[in-house]
C-alpha cells in the first residue's frame, strides 16, 4: 500500500515576479496518473484541474491573465492519485512588480573598480516604503535585502570579477508587492583574473538566494528552464 | 492492521446535532485522507465529504456543506463528524473511510445516527 | 455532479452463473471508479479499484473492466458468499458518487 506520493513541483512562467496587470501561469508538475490537481493560495483552495487523460500527463498548469496585489502572495500545490493526496509543494512566492513607483540604485565609487575596492549599491525611493531589494541579473538571479527610510545601502565589500553584472533594485511595499525596477546599472570590475578564478560566484550575496531564474532586461524575467525547480533559498520567508 | 472504530449509535432530536468519532488504528493517520459517507435504512451510499488530517483542509458535497464539520485530531489519530440542525431524513447509518491511492479501501464498523422526536 | 447509472438494480442468479453488473458515468471519468460489495448490517468491503484492479484479498472470479463512461463487474461463478449487494463509485471529481446498487440474490 503506498503511503506517500512525492511532492509536486511548483514554478511560474515566465517568472515570478509578474508586472501588475501582465499574465502569469503557475505550473505544477506531480505525477502522470494523478487524478486531481489542487492549487492552494495563502492556505485556502484557489482552483483544480484534472488533467485528461489522467495516465498521459504529469503537469497542469493555472493561468493568471491579469496580475495584481490581490493574487500576489504564497501558492502551492497538492496532487492525488485516486484519494490519496501528496504532500505539499514548496511553497512559491508570486511577487507583483511595477507597483507606484520607480527607485534610482546608484554605485559608489562608480560603476567602473577595481578587484579589491569596496563598492556600495544605494536604491533610493521617496515613497513610503523600508524594504528594498538588490537584484544581480545572470543564470541565479540573487537578491538581497536592505532597509531604511527613503534609501538602502548594499554594501558588497571588496570586490572581485565575480561581482561584474548588471543591477537593479526594487522598492517593496509588503513581501510580495514591489515597486517598478531601477534603471539597471552595470558594475565592471577590472583585476588580476588568477586571484579572483576560484572566487565564488556572487560571494556577497551567501543569504538570500533564488538558483532558479534568469533575468534579461529585453524581455523582462524570464525562468532558467535548466534551474526550474524552485529549491534555493527564499528571500521572502 | 488498520482499523477505524467509531462511537456509538445515537439518538437524537430534530434540530439538534451530533458529533460522530473515528479512531484509527494501524497506520500512519496524517498519511491518508478520511472520508465520511452514510446510508439511509434500506438505501444507497452518499459521500459526505473528507479531511486531509496532516494539513487540517476538507472538502465537502455541497449538500451537506453548511452543515458539516469534519475535523481531525492528529494527537489521538481520532477523525470526528459533525452534523447541525438534524432532521428526519438524517436518520442513516454513517461510515468512516479512509482513502488511499485504491479509494476507499478500509470502513469504520457504522454509527447508527436516529433522528426522531 | 457525475451521475453514476448502475444496473440492473437487482438479480436472481444461481450458484455457479457468470453475473455481469453495468455502471455509466454521466461524463468520462477515465477509469477513476471502484467497485464495492455489501452485505447486510455490514460496512462495504473493497473489490475493484482504478476500474480493473483487484483489491487485496478479492477472490479472481471477480473482475472490473471498461473505461470512459461505461464500466463493467464481472463475476465469473456466483458463490454462495457472493450474495450481496454492489455498488460503484467514482472518484474523479468532487462529490464522489455512487450508482444505486444492484441487490444479488439467490434465485
Known amino acids: 500500500q503506498q503511503q506517500t506520493l512525492p511532492k509536486p513541483f511548483i514554478w511560474a512562467e515566465p517568472h515570478f515576479m509578474v508586472p501588475k496587470e501582465k499574465q502569469v501561469t503557475i505550473c505544477c508538475q506531480g505525477n502522470y496518473g494523478a487524478v486531481e490537481y489542487q492549487l492552494h493560495f495563502e492556505g485556502s483552495l484557489f482552483a483544480v484541474d484534472r488533467p485528461k487523460p489522467p495516465e498521459r500527463i504529469n503537469k497542469v498548469k493555472f493561468y493568471i491573465p491579469d496580475m495584481n496585489s490581490r493574487m500576489a502572495g504564497q501558492y502551492s500545490c497538492i496532487y492525488r492519485v485516486g484519494e490519496l493526496w501528496s504532500e505539499p509543494s514548496n511553497l512559491l512566492d508570486l511577487v507583483v512588480t511595477e507597483m507606484y513607483d520607480t527607485p534610482t540604485l546608484s554605485v559608489h565609487p562608480g560603476p567602473e573598480v577595481i578587484s579589491g575596492e569596496k563598492v556600495t549599491f544605494y536604491c533610493r525611493l521617496d515613497t513610503a516604503t523600508s524594504m528594498f531589494l538588490l537584484l544581480k541579473e545572470g543564470r541565479s538571479s540573487h537578491v538581497q535585502r536592505g532597509y531604511g527610510k527613503v534609501q538602502a545601502e548594499f554594501p558588497l565589500g571588496p570586490v572581485t570579477t565575480a561581482h561584474r553584472g548588471t543591477y537593479r533594485c526594487f522598492g517593496s511595499y509588503n513581501n510580495h508587492a514591489w515597486s517598478f525596477p531601477s534603471e539597471p546599472v552595470k558594475l565592471l570590475v577590472t583585476g588580476d583574473i588568477e586571484n579572483t578564478s576560484l572566487a565564488p560566484e556572487d560571494p556577497t550575496f551567501p543569504a538570500d538566494t533564488w538558483g532558479t531564474y534568469l533575468l534579461t532586461t529585453e524581455t523582462g524575467l524570464q525562468k532558467d528552464h535548466a534551474l526550474w525547480d524552485h529549491t534555493a533559498q527564499n528571500l521572502l520567508r | 492492521q488498520v482499523q477505524l472504530v467509531q462511537s456509538g449509535a445515537e439518538v437524537k432530536k430534530p434540530g439538534a446535532s451530533v458529533k460522530v468519532s473515528c479512531k484509527a488504528s494501524?497506520?500512519?493517520?496524517?498519511?491518508?485522507?478520511m472520508h465520511w459517507v452514510r446510508q439511509a435504512p434500506g438505501q444507497g451510499l452518499e459521500w459526505i465529504g473528507y479531511?486531509?488530517?496532516?494539513?487540517?483542509?476538507?472538502e465537502y458535497n455541497q449538500k451537506f456543506k453548511d452543515r458539516t464539520t469534519i475535523t481531525a485530531d492528529k494527537s489521538t489519530s481520532t477523525a470526528y463528524m459533525e452534523l447541525s440542525s438534524l432532521r428526519s431524513e438524517d436518520t442513516a447509518v454513517y461510515y468512516c473511510?479512509?482513502?488511499?491511492?485504491?479509494?476507499?479501501?478500509?470502513w469504520g464498523q457504522g454509527t447508527l445516527v436516529t433522528v426522531s422526536s | 455532479d457525475i451521475q453514476m447509472t448502475q444496473s440492473p438494480s437487482s438479480l436472481s442468479a444461481s450458484v455457479g452463473d457468470r453475473v455481469t453488473i453495468t455502471c455509466r458515468a454521466s461524463?468520462?471519468?477515465?477509469?477513476?471508479l471502484a467497485w464495492f460489495q455489501q452485505k447486510p448490517g455490514k460496512a462495504p468491503k473493497l473489490l475493484v479499484y482504478?476500474?480493473?484492479n483487484l483489491a487485496d484479498g478479492v477472490p479472481s472470479r471477480f473482475s472490473g473492466s471498461g473505461s470512459g463512461t461505461d464500466y463493467t463487474l464481472t463475476i465469473s461463478s456466483l458463490q454462495p458468499e457472493d450474495f450481496a449487494t454492489y455498488y460503484c463509485?467514482?472518484?474523479?471529481?468532487?462529490?464522489?458518487?455512487f450508482g444505486g446498487g444492484t441487490k444479488v440474490e439467490i434465485k
Open positions: 473511510v479512509r482513502g488511499s491511492s485504491r479509494g476507499f479501501d478500509y
Open positions: 494501524g497506520y500512519t493517520f496524517t498519511s491518508f485522507t
Open positions: 479531511i486531509n488530517p496532516s494539513s487540517g483542509y476538507t
Open positions: 461524463e468520462n471519468i477515465y477509469s477513476n
Open positions: 482504478a476500474a480493473t
Open positions: 463509485q467514482h472518484f474523479w471529481g468532487t462529490p464522489r458518487t
